[in-house]
């Protein structure tokens, strides 16, 4: 729990992880009935859309450029003048995907498991991708992984997701380091399949939670 | 574990001042804002405002401005909800609840208010 | 302030049934909306938040849905523990408001 319960809460919907193109709303929630704010990017490129404007309660962003990856913070106020800026909310980052060719996913032992047993996502390109990313569900989840080399050429990342108890649909980017917000194409869907047990959206070992989306590193 | 304790029930006259305590234990409380929540009987949920427990800093909803008072012993871990000039129709359950991103993760038990 | 609309206001069902709780809310609130179940005599409990996140320990027959003004709530094979009052509720932002309540009676 992040602290300071009067500063706005900044989210993304409908995800913070967004493809090259697409659009995403920024909503700058409050508990002090803020009705308008301001929004800015604390890193890399900054986004001219944005600069010296006031937003009512949420703005679409988009159609969405490498440029637009990286971390956003938001300042609730009321519509007075002068205006009086809020502290700044969280920060939120922001995820572009699509940039590079699509890695691959696979299970082991295999994407049907019995309940309780250990399952490891292997995320894998012929590219020299530095991190990969798993995604449960078109959510995002930490951790993110270091790109490994394997004896037959690929680069590889192993993320063990613990004694299976739920299902579910599984997708991976790849990124590079100096650019960790642009992802690639998510990689083709896995379906995990746990038997003996019905799939569930409450957290669990199978389901890393993530409230906020991506978090910085 | 987290809980949140209310005081018990009251029993008060028209005019009188009622003050409901709300003891928060198993987390941090200045970590969180505490909110009150009213249910007359056989009615539902109404929200009433929040405190920031580490400021202090009180806001009301509109139909709650004037006669309430939400306040804090942090040193105790617990809020207080004080209503002045007690009338009929205020007469209900009221509930302390944990906000975490704006809903509400855990309540207290309710303390009964009975003005009569 | 962002109006609630909650349906039906009271419903009777039996046992290994399914049904369905109803919210519309009088704008957009994207996937920010919370549901509780209250017993008689009892606090509310959130069940759902986020519009479909299930709480920790909630049983898997519950299963939040919707987003922008239009949300429900769905519980598979009724069991007797499930009967009582069911609440909506936006957080968007303040002036927080909750719906008028379902009452889920057995038949």
């Known amino acids: 729990h992040e602290g300071g319960q009067d500063k706005p809460l900044l989210s993304a919907w409908p995800s913070a992880v967004v493809p090259r193109g697409g659009h995403v709303t920024l909503l700058c929630r409050s508990r002090l009935g803020f009705t308008i704010f301001s929004l800015y990017k604390e890193d890399g490129v900054p986004v001219p859309e944005l600069y010296n404007k006031i937003f009512w309660k949420s703005i679409l962003m988009g159609p969405v450029t490498p440029a637009h990856a990286g971390t956003y913070r938001c300042r609730g106020s009321h519509p007075r003048s002068p205006i009086e800026w809020s502290a700044p909310s969280n920060p939120l980052v922001i995820v572009v995907t699509g940039l590079f060719g699509k890695p691959s996913l696979s299970a082991q032992p295999g994407p049907t498991v019995r309940t309780g047993e250990n399952v490891t996502l292997s995320c894998s390109s012929r590219s020299s991708f530095d991190m990969y990313h798993l995604s449960r569900e078109g959510r995002a989840h930490e951790p993110r992984l270091p790109a490994v080399p394997s004896v037959d050429g690929t680069f590889q990342a192993d993320f063990p997701l613990g004694p299976a108890t739920h299902g579910g649909t599984y997708t991976c980017f790849s990124s590079l380091h100096d650019s960790p917000y642009e992802w690639s194409d998510p990689s083709d869907p896995l379906l995990v399949s746990v038997t003996g047990n019905s799939s569930s959206s409450s957290s669990s070992p199978t389901e890393p939670s993530s409230k906020t989306g991506i978090r910085r590193h | 574990q987290i809980q949140l304790v209310q005081s018990g029930p009251e029993l008060k006259k028209p005019g009188e001042t009622v003050k409901i305590s709300c003891k928060a234990s198993g987390y941090t409380f200045t970590d969180y804002s505490m909110h009150w929540v009213k249910q007359a009987p056989g009615k539902g949920l109404k929200w009433m405002g929040w405190?920031?427990?580490?400021?202090?800093?009180?806001t009301y909803a509109d139909d709650f401005k004037g006669r309430f008072a939400f306040s804090l012993e942090t040193s105790a871990t617990t809020a207080y909800l004080q209503i002045n000039n007690l009338k009929n129709e205020d007469t209900a359950t009221y509930f302390c609840?944990?906000?975490?991103?704006?809903?509400?993760?855990?309540w207290g038990q309710g303390t009964t208010l009975t003005v009569s | 302030d962002i109006q609630m609309t909650q349906s039906p206001a009271s419903l009777s069902a039996s046992v290994g049934e399914t049904v369905t709780i109803t919210c519309r809310t009088s704008e957009n609130i994207y996937s920010y909306l919370a549901w509780y179940q209250q017993k008689q005599g009892k606090s509310p409990q959130l069940l759902v938040y986020?519009?479909?996140t299930l709480v920790e320990g909630v049983p898997s027959r519950f299963s939040g849905s919707g987003s922008g003004t239009q949300f429900s709530v769905k519980i598979n094979s009724l069991q007797p523990e499930d009967f009582g009052n069911y609440y909506c509720q936006h957080h968007y932002g303040i002036p927080f408001t909750f719906g008028g309540g379902t009452k889920l009676e057995i038949k």
């Open positions: 405190i920031n427990t580490e400021t202090g800093g009180p």
């Open positions: 986020n519009a479909k």
């Open positions: 609840s944990r906000d975490v991103d704006l809903y509400f993760d855990y």
